[in-house]
Amino acid sequence: IIPVEEENPDFWNRQAAEALGAAKKLQPAQTAAKNLIIFLGDGMGVSTVTAARILKGQKKDKLGPETFLAMDRFPYVALSKTYSVDKHVPDSGATATAYLCGVKGNFQTIGLSAAARFNQCNTTRGNEVISVMNRAKKAGKSVGVVTTTRVQHASPAGAYAHTVNRNWYSDADVPASARQEGCQDIATQLISNMDIDVILGGGRKYMFPMGTPDPEYPDDYSQGGTRLDGKNLVQEWLAKHQGARYVWNRTELLQASLDPSVTHLMGLFEPGDMKYEIHRDSTLDPSLMEMTEAALLLLSRNPRGFFLFVEGGRIDHGHHESRAYRALTETIMFDDAIERAGQLTSEEDTLSLVTADHSHVFSFGGYPLRGSSIFGLAPGKARDRKAYTVLLYGNGPGYVLKDGARPDVTESESGSPEYRQQSAVPLDGETHAGEDVAVFARGPQAHLVHGVQEQTFIAHVMAFAACLEPYTACDLAPRAGTTD
Amino acid sequence: IIPVEEENPDFWNRQAAEALGAAKKLQPAQTAAKNLIIFLGDGMGVSTVTAARILKGQKKDKLGPETFLAMDRFPYVALSKTYSVDKHVPDSGATATAYLCGVKGNFQTIGLSAAARFNQCNTTRGNEVISVMNRAKKAGKSVGVVTTTRVQHASPAGAYAHTVNRNWYSDADVPASARQEGCQDIATQLISNMDIDVILGGGRKYMFPMGTPDPEYPDDYSQGGTRLDGKNLVQEWLAKHQGARYVWNRTELLQASLDPSVTHLMGLFEPGDMKYEIHRDSTLDPSLMEMTEAALLLLSRNPRGFFLFVEGGRIDHGHHESRAYRALTETIMFDDAIERAGQLTSEEDTLSLVTADHSHVFSFGGYPLRGSSIFGLAPGKARDRKAYTVLLYGNGPGYVLKDGARPDVTESESGSPEYRQQSAVPLDGETHAGEDVAVFARGPQAHLVHGVQEQTFIAHVMAFAACLEPYTACDLAPRAGTTD
């Protein structure tokens, strides 16, 4: 498919001249940022960004790659080196420590320097590192965490927790010996480490005592409370704040976000992770875009500004399942949230960053025709005389071990939301990848986001832009329209 | 392996503060570029960059990812959308048209708008688009092409040729009907379309008549001249310029580059593509770094400046073979050439860009320990009870079809330069990938390289920076120290 206008060199020359004009007009804002938003696409490597762009375009009846994601419109781009101190290819815990706290840690640890050792409780104390969100709170800003995973998951936990094991969601997950040594589960830290104004995502079951039925799935014991300490953490959190509200469904969320008496909001919409966007019951669960909007409505009331973490956390899960359909539809919803946030904020006073914690062994090849489905087949046959998809994984669960032979695939099979793309190596979970990821930036001090940087740089740019510790002597003009 | 200094948060905080300091000091140069250099890593997607960084670091006895490639030091980064007008995943011909001419074309065509159709000679005329190199020459600059492939290959050909088929290296490759219609082979266009001051790479056999023995392999008929028209294109080229010299080995190249009487230099060091860096006979063939240095010595004599295209062209070939060792060692030599060029030029007057034409379905996963070999095994076993490598391909020739079962692999096997990493889909050649690639920029107007751009933007930035067509009214101050 060749669009006739693209056959004319003028089309490309005009377009490039316009892009050059925009580039020449770019003026680094010398003001401080009143607000900080970090959008984290978990597992959203560059291959995921491109594939999602094409899918988003095709959902709008375009050919695909010529369209723009919301993040594509951000004027500044850098590359971020994602390795953890102990691994070439990191996990979401060590990376969260890097981009939220500004310090690299070890694989599967959160909010701790690399002096802490995975799973060794006694290496926690004294090795805690403080997140930019925590520093923003100390500076009088409102702060929020929004995610499509459980709110106690590795990425959001980087904003508030310190743990040698990212899997310690509730106290039931913490070994008795570690509990005795004083190591707290992540859910406990969520409500006790710092005052978070807005908490939206999944993770209900970690907040309630064992035996507490889940409000949405009361007959499913496995979805009920998991806590062994008998604590109702939601109740404890509500008791801390006069204007606090807890919600567990979309209707309540939308009401609460418009209620001026609500100062603190916790919304936990699933017992564990939230449902994939394609499976979401839109009467019960809000989308990431809706959660982001609700958070911004509350947080933006603070004249001193806010810090907001927004995670498209299940991009990663789709990839781990080798189900690109899930990963890419999650990426599109993540991008929709970025777009909505852009409409609700001003780049005059809000530094917005979009990045990934790491990539995945996900590739998009095979020379497909422009306009063909991103989930489709490559032209020609493979050496085993079978068709193959343009999307593939290096490793993962897209395998059939029975007779060793790779299964054939049809266009209708590969287009299914349940289809698992094939992989070279059969694993029960596809793995992360270690290549650099993109950082997109817009707003005050966004121009500092440049070149190739350590992932830790992201936290430091945010702290500097908002004149937070350790950059309180930032020497930046107050942002326009500041009221503080 | 955990470096003890990295356990201390101060290590990361200091490092990030320094990076912030450098970012704050970045001042966009408002001058024009006297010189333009585009370094093209063919097939060098972001996963290749990261893996090469680790390998380069480990060759220096470091753990790997914390080290810097020369390209990592470039202050500005953008992402480039590489699709061709007709394909989501492009080839090196259509992409060369984009980044060298500023216009997107169709798969496997070169130097032509998308109105031209692959292999249809009669769609050539009237659809030619002019490269930045050609425009630089018209503006009085010296120009050069350096590559590790044959100089008639798709990427370098984008600088000087117009062809509906990238495979028409010599007239023997052009169908008689197309020859009759007036379509010229790429080798002919190399010497006749424009005056190129420096031409260095492979591709001897396309320049000489059939039956001409190759000077390096005189007994191998397949390496001798291929031309059917009886022309000796080297002789024709030498006759055009008083100070022209042709060389075919390293010794002659080094002599010629230091000879002030040489104004034009053609060095063709292999009959076809140059040898992989790991196979290069360093007494006979120069490295990419040496060719780059030789080119710069000649080109920099021109007070009006120069345009230089430098291609690490066999990164791509290593990937097509699913031999990551070859791809990554080629990338390191490419980076060494960038480093050397940086020492021989000034960023005050030279705009240097580093980019890729496209990526490959190459991934680096599996959670290997920091410091472990990039060519090594991932921790754990796969579901088929076998080991697996951290480097893998989505598709490609790293397969065994005999009994359908994936072969086991040992650390010593996977570390071999000949080892082919495994792939999900068995193909005789691994394919390109369609995700965005990085553009690294340094020098005058490098700040224009930002955000997410069409690949065409690269050519326009170069043209604008040097005030070439269509940006002669560029309104930029002459660069410091201009002598023209």
């Epitope: 799973n119 029960d428 | 921790p379 754990g380 080991a387």
Partner: antibody, heavy 130, light 111 residues
Framework: QEHLEESGGGLVKPEGSLTLTCTAS?????????MCWVRQAPGKGLEWIAC???????TYYASWAKGRFTISKTSSTTVTLQMTSLTAADTATYFC???????????????????????WGPGTLVTVSS | QVLTQTPSSVSAAVGGTVTINCQSS????????FSWYQQKPGQPPKLLIY???RLASGVPSRFKGSGSGTQFTLTISGVQCDDAATYYC????????????FGGGTEVVVK
């Protein structure tokens, strides 16, 4: 040839402690395997006790073994099982076994699954009696 | 987790077929993290079948494993005298942590 050999068994009094050692030959512990302990009371079936992943030191225990039994890697070829508060019910042959470690992504986290036991030692008898 | 193995004892004539069942109280991980072992008196167990149905190296093809999730079967066709032993099933589970369980064993007597 790959072998496992247990040592340290013998007679121990009730409430006493004992440490068993498993020594590997022909291979060294790596990220490809878990090292585990399984026991078998006289005339009874097999009972899993614990496993350790040598790569990161992660340990997993049967619920009944938590607190009383501790598995450790002491070198690249030895693992130990420390047993405390022993009772007559702990009388058994204790086997050291190797299990394949498969990467898995479970419950939102990374792990290596303990799969089948592909290599066993001959066992060492522990008798708890006064 | 409970793995119920039936029968606890079975006798078979040479050349006959033996079927042993194993039922799990919950699904094993990935529905196929399931193995079968053979143990002879005074010896450690020996792996026969892994991943529910795959034959371990050197194991004769008369041993066959099948099943998925919670129900698994070991079938020995063309029983030989050397097959007299006790057979154990084993499953791998995940619930916040990995754990393993063995069945109670089935003694196979060959007549």
């Amino acid at each position: 040839q790959e072998h496992l050999e247990e040592s340290g068994g013998g007679l121990v009094k009730p409430e006493g402690s004992l440490t068993l050692t498993c020594t590997a030959s022909g291979f060294s512990f790596s990220s490809s395997y878990y090292m585990c302990w399984v026991r078998q009371a006289p005339g009874k079936g097999l009972e899993w006790i614990a496993c350790i992943y040598p790569d990161d030191g992660n340990t997993y225990y049967a619920s009944w073994a938590k607190g009383r039994f501790t598995i450790s890697k002491t070198s690249s070829t030895t693992v130990t099982l420390q047993m405390t508060s022993l009772t007559a019910a702990d009388t058994a042959t204790y086997f050291c076994a190797r299990a394949l470690a498969y990467y898995a992504y479970v419950d939102g986290g990374h792990s290596y699954a303990i799969n089948d036991f592909d290599l066993w030692g001959p066992g060492t008898l522990v008798t708890v009696s006064s | 987790q409970v793995l119920t193995q039936t029968p606890s004892s079975v006798s078979a004539a040479v050349g006959g077929t033996v079927t042993i069942n194993c039922q799990s109280s919950q699904s094993v991980f990935s529905n196929d993290y399931f193995s079968w072992y053979q143990q002879k008196p005074g010896q450690p167990p020996k792996l026969l079948i892994y991943d529910a149905s795959r034959l371990a190296s050197g194991v004769p093809s008369r041993f066959k494993g099948s099943g998925s999730g919670t129900q698994f079967t070991l079938t020995i066709s063309g029983v030989q005298c050397d097959d007299a032993a006790t057979y154990y099933c084993q499953g791998t589970y995940y619930s916040s942590a990995w754990y393993n369980a063995f069945g109670g064993g089935t003694e196979v007597v060959v007549k």
